[in-house]
């Protein structure tokens, strides 16, 4: 049995920040679980991890230098990424693992979310203002 994951197909990160919600076909509240977000088609970079245990506080961390936070719903985990760079535009995949109680469960690979990071562009004032009306 595999858990199904739903993600938005695409998100635009204005102001270099984005909320990515991973929706699962599974209630996480009475489980020990590890939810993670992975970058790239090969999911090579583990961007952020949310570790949950029903009796303890949520642990959120990144071992790859991303600024992230996480929030738990009963069938979802939302990753909040900040300080993203334009060159971190990529496809991001949600992963979920239920560690306890047994048996171990994980998800079918999702379609992923393309996060398009738009850098902050300041609009310069025009050098030559248009002709003034008399």
């Amino acid at each position: 049995n595999k858990i199904l994951v739903k993600q938005s197909p695409m998100l635009v990160a204005y102001d270099n920040a984005v909320n990515l919600s991973c929706k699962y076909s599974y209630n996480l509240f009475s489980r020990e679980f590890r939810a993670s977000l992975h970058k790239g088609l090969d999911s090579a970079v583990e961007v952020c991890v949310v570790y949950g245990n029903y009796s303890q506080q949520l642990q959120v961390y990144s071992k790859t230098g991303f600024n992230c936070d996480g929030k738990l719903g009963n069938e979802s985990v939302t990753f909040y990424l900040q300080n993203l760079y334009v060159n971190q535009t990529d496809i991001y995949f949600c992963k979920i693992e239920v560690m306890y109680p047994p048996p171990y469960l994980d998800n079918e690979k999702s379609n992923g979310t393309i996060i398009h990071v738009k850098g902050k562009h300041l609009c310069p004032s025009p050098l030559f203002p248009g002709p003034s009306k008399p």
């Epitope: 049995n1 209630n27 996480l28 509240f29 009475s30 029903y54 109680p101 047994p102 048996p103």
Partner: antibody
């Protein structure tokens, strides 16, 4: 279909031990937790503990630690509960039940028929 | 440990009556609750899981409701075959305690 077949009734003397068996069929034995429950005459259901044959994980109710020991034999798809140092208070019907995971919510949809253990001098 | 307080402990009702049994917990169990029916000498039968989900094959007169720390099982129109004992059980960690039970007798 899923079946849990328990061993027959037992009559034991105080201080003795008893081993109750629960033979599973109709599913992959190592993929499901088996719970054990006690029912004393005129009283309610008491949860004893669970055993996961896939990894031999066990959880006991603190009240039954030192009283009940859960084990399994994968080759025969059987889970066992041994009760030691029997007293008249251990006289009860003991049930095994399979835990199913309903998308993150647990319940016990499949039960054995029960094993009556009587402790009497 | 989670404490389960089930009430009433016994109940006598007539065929056709609407009956409600309640189960209270000392902390939020997030709907990780099941209801069982047990008749004398028989194994318990699962009626409801996840507080509100009716098991396939169980008559629709049975329903579960509640959230947080308060849950209930309702039989909308009592039938003669509904006599017996009813138990709630939580699955919010271990021990997976049962409620004390409700003995339902038909008048």
């Amino acid at each position: 279909q899923v079946q849990l077949q328990q061993s027959g009734a037992e009559l034991k003397k105080p201080g003795a031990s008893v081993k109750v068996s629960c033979k599973a069929s109709g599913y992959t034995f190592t993929e499901y937790i088996i719970h054990w429950i006690k029912l004393r005459s005129g009283q309610g259901l008491e949860w004893i503990g669970w055993f996961y044959p896939g990894s031999n994980d066990i959880q006991y109710n603190a009240q039954f630690k030192g009283k009940a020991t859960l084990t399994a034999d994968k080759s025969s798809s059987t889970v066992y509960m041994e009760l030691t140092g029997l007293t008249p208070e251990d006289s009860a019907v003991y049930f095994c039940a399979r835990r199913d995971d309903f998308s993150g919510y647990d319940a016990l949809p499949y039960w054995g028929q029960g094993t009556l253990v009587t402790v009497s001098a | 440990d989670i404490q389960m307080t089930q009430s009433p402990s016994s109940l006598s009702a007539s065929v056709g009556d609407r009956v409600t049994i309640t189960c209270k917990t000392n902390e939020n169990i997030y709907s990780n609750l099941a209801w069982y029916q047990q008749k004398d000498g028989k194994s318990p039968q699962l009626l409801i899981y996840a507080a509100t989900h009716l098991v396939e094959g169980v008559p629709s007169r049975f329903s579960g409701s509640g959230s947080g720390t308060q849950y209930s099982l309702t039989i909308s129109s009592l039938q003669p075959e509904d006599f017996g004992n009813y138990y709630c059980q939580h699955f919010w960690g271990t021990p997976c305690t049962f409620g004390g039970g409700t003995k339902l007798e038909i008048k």
